[in-house]
């Protein structure tokens, strides 16, 4: 008995599609071996029509595909535009066609039901609108127009020109009779229901001279579109429901085991708490279409999703819907990265953001998720260097470590910084990820002065104290600008044993600016890192003033003031460029700050990492 299993009998009608699901034991070998769909010929040979290795026969070109779901132990063969010629005996299998790992499937494609001659066929999705056209002759122009529904051998009146409306169609049907000279009347049915499916008869006049026209109305419930996304990645549901519902509330819901549909998000402000911080409903276009983005995908997000429109913001029968079946692949290409990053008030966080390594040149962004209404995610920083004004001096996006990961550093943390942030690029939208920043009790590990005033032409020395646990880390100072944080050159004072025996007095890395120039004004960061992986940072603002007193200044943390609140910025305003982002509607236009000037001059700035007992220390 073959371990492969599927449907023995599949039946459909011409023009339709089938989606044949075959199951196999998900062993490591089975998961990765070739999957195929072949047709058994008279000779007994089975000719491949489509395979998981990308082969598609000419007969199936443009209308069939095979998708493997390795973690589920299934593969799906989709065949569209079926014809009677597709009827026959097939096999779905693993490995080589002639070997035994396969399952026999019989496919029968029949003609649609026999319809009276001249029948017009209308195929419409549930919830949409149909317009049935009914021609008539001049002599029947003044006579009664009507639409009947054929149920078995009887005809039930649906609507007529004497203002009768069948209760089943109340408030969603209208009969239109055009002006003189036009020999056609129309019946418009809105918000189609499955029960509207069937054969209709238009009639104008009565007796032997009456005009009749048959209409076959096929109301389809949408076939769910299979969506296959990676764990930790992102999915976008694009929902286009038509102009008829452009001004009606929209929703995305997930079908539960009770066959009801739980609202995930809607335009009335409702949102499922399970999606907090990782969902956005994009504002709709003029045509009523909208999209919903969910990031940080989890296995439990799998299921059937419906989008729709209704004034209540939830599913109601007879309103248009679109459907998706979401599968979440656990064998994800998206690397694990912390979903929660903790920092202390006054301290910092370094967030690692994954991106598709094939898209190293893509623009990188970081945005703050805001839950109000449908959610929005205004950009805070991007790799081209623009930073939102209120984040000046405390936020930077670094391309390091590279090869599929960039880093975002945020310091001077306050409780207001707690929340959800999204990492994204202008490339592969499936790599959008979410991180939550939590502010916890504690003290920052790095201690720097809060506010430093330097004197033009003199020497400035700024200390940065760090705990012993960072003794093996690389220490650095850098000058912040809105294009990044430019590392300042180290002053190598020869080999040092300063950190071998870490004591209370040997935990200092200091920045020296000599002589201080106007260009030195700005934000400086002291930080620790290991290779290309950044740790904590602390920020200090250096203001530069005219010479008042001669001599060198050494600023100790004890004398530090708070960083200035009222720095006058040369701020520019720029709209986020639509072209830079795949779906620009995710983001609001935000004010950003222009570059805050030149970097500190080369040899004038030096970093000294030394023991206060052994002044010969140098730092890496």
């Amino acid at each position: 008995k073959s371990p492969v299993f599927g449907p023995q009998e599949v039946s459909s009608v011409e023009g339709n599609s089938v989606s044949i699901k075959c199951y196999y034991p998900p062993t490591s070998v089975n998961r990765h071996t070739r999957k195929y769909w072949c047709r058994k010929g008279a000779s007994g040979r089975c000719i491949t029509l489509v395979s998981s290795e990308g082969y598609v026969s000419s007969n199936y070109a443009g209308r069939a595909n095979l998708t493997n779901f390795p973690e589920n132990g299934t593969f799906v063969v989709n065949i569209a535009q079926l014809s009677r010629d597709d009827s026959g005996h097939y096999k779905c299998g693993l490995g080589i066609n002639s070997r035994g790992l396969s399952f026999d499937v019989s496919l029968e494609v029949s003609q649609g039901p026999e319809l009276p001659n001249g029948t017009e066929v209308y195929t419409v999705d549930v919830g949409r609108t149909v317009t049935i056209k009914c021609p008539f002759k001049t002599e029947n122009a003044p006579k009664t127009k009507a639409l009947y529904k054929k149920i078995g051998q009887t005809s039930v009146l649906v609507i007529d020109s004497r203002n009768y409306v069948n209760p089943n169609y109340k408030d969603r049907i209208r009969l239109r009779i055009p002006g003189t000279g036009q020999l056609i009347f129309t019946v418009v049915i809105d918000r189609l229901r499955l029960s509207d499916h069937g054969l209709y008869l238009c009639q104008a006049g009565d007796g032997s001279n009456r005009d009749e026209k048959n209409a076959d109305l096929q109301v389809l419930e949408p076939e769910p579109e299979l969506v296959y996304e990676d764990l930790r990645g992102s999915v976008t549901f694009h929902c286009a429901l038509g102009l008829e519902v452009a001004n009606v509330a929209k929703f995305l819901c997930r079908v539960n085991s009770r066959e009801t549909c739980d609202v995930v998000i809607n335009t009335l402000g409702k949102r499922d708490s399970a999606f907090e911080g990782r969902i956005l409903l994009n504002p709709q276009d003029k045509d009523g279409s909208f999209s919903v983005v969910i990031t940080g995908l989890r296995k439990e997000d799998e299921g059937r999703y419906l989008c729709g429109a209704h004034s209540d913001g939830q599913l109601q029968e007879g309103w248009p819907i679109q459907a998706w079946q979401l599968f979440v692949n656990e064998e994800s290409t998206i690397p694990r990265s912390p979903t929660v990053v903790k920092g202390v008030a006054g301290g910092s966080v370094a967030v690692l953001c994954p991106y598709n390594p094939k898209e190293s040149q893509s623009l990188k962004y970081w945005c703050l998720w805001e839950g109000a209404q449908n959610g929005r995610c205004p950009l805070l920083v991007e790799s081209q260097g623009l930073v939102q004004e209120q984040y000046e001096g405390r936020l930077s996006l670094l391309q390091e470590p590279g090869n599929g990961t960039f880093t975002v550093i945020l310091n001077q943390l306050t409780t207001q910084d707690a929340g959800f942030y999204w990492c994204l690029t202008n490339g592969d939208t499936r790599w959008r990820t979410t991180v939550e920043i939590k502010i916890i009790e504690g003290e920052p590990n790095l201690k720097v002065p809060g506010n430093v005033t330097a004197v033009l032409g003199e020497t400035l020395n700024i200390p940065c104290h760090f705990p012993c646990k960072f003794s093996s880390y690389e220490k650095y100072w850098c000058k912040w600008s809105n294009t990044g944080c430019q590392t300042l050159p180290s002053q190598d004072e020869g080999p040092s044993e300063a950190f071998v025996n870490c004591d209370e007095n040997s935990r200092l890395v200091s920045l020296t600016l000599n002589p201080v120039t106007r260009a030195d004004e700005g934000w400086y960061w002291c930080g620790v890192k290991q290779g290309h992986f950044y740790g904590e940072t602390a920020a200090v603002y250096v203001a530069v003033e005219e010479k008042k007193v001669a001599g060198s200044r050494y600023v100790s943390p004890a004398k530090a003031d708070a960083a200035p609140d009222e720095k006058v910025l040369d701020s520019g305003v720029r709209e986020i460029e639509n072209k830079a982002i795949q779906d620009p509607r995710l983001f609001a236009e935000e004010k950003v700050v222009a570059d805050t000037g030149d970097q500190a001059g080369g040899s004038r700035a030096s970093v000294d990492s030394s023991s206060s007992e052994e002044q010969g220390g140098s730092s890496k």
Partner: nanobody, 126 residues
Framework: EVQLVESGGGLVQAGGSLRLSCAAS????????MGWFRQAPGKEREFVGA??????????YYEDSVKGRFTISRDNAKNTVPLQMNSLKPEDTGVYFC?????????????????WGQGTLVTVSS
């Protein structure tokens, strides 16, 4: 909420026929799957057959031991899934259950189904 009710069970001689029916009430979304299972006294519930549908496409699944003897179908008008059982054998004896789900999971597994009927007893005497 979906309710499933089985009917049509009874006592039949070996070689005879029975027609079971599973009636569904409540809202279903487009594609749907219903499966028939049976449980002999002291044994696990085992797969008999299943039917899935989506639009005008139908998919039928059978356990090897019933293939060619049992036929599963769908009666749209009555919202029922009948199971026609021919050439019955004593080993077909058991309580027959129908299960329903709107997902197309592996129909052979009981875990694939979200709700169940109460069952109907089929006894095949030799």
């Amino acid at each position: 909420e979906v309710q499933l009710v089985e009917s049509g069970g009874g006592l039949v001689q070996a070689g005879g026929s029975l027609r079971l029916s599973c009636a569904a009430s409540g809202r279903t979304f487009g594609s749907y799957s219903m499966g028939w299972f049976r449980q002999a006294p002291g044994k696990e519930r085992e797969f008999v057959g299943a039917i899935s549908w989506s639009g005008s496409s139908t998919y039928k699944y059978y356990e090897d031991s019933v293939k060619g003897r049992f036929t599963i179908s769908r009666d749209n008008a009555k919202n029922t899934v009948p199971l026609q059982m021919n050439s019955l054998k004593p080993e077909d004896t058991g309580v027959y259950f129908c299960g329903g789900t709107m997902e197309r999971r592996d129909p052979r597994r009981t875990s694939a189904y979200d709700y169940w009927g109460q069952g109907t007893l089929v006894t095949v005497s030799s």
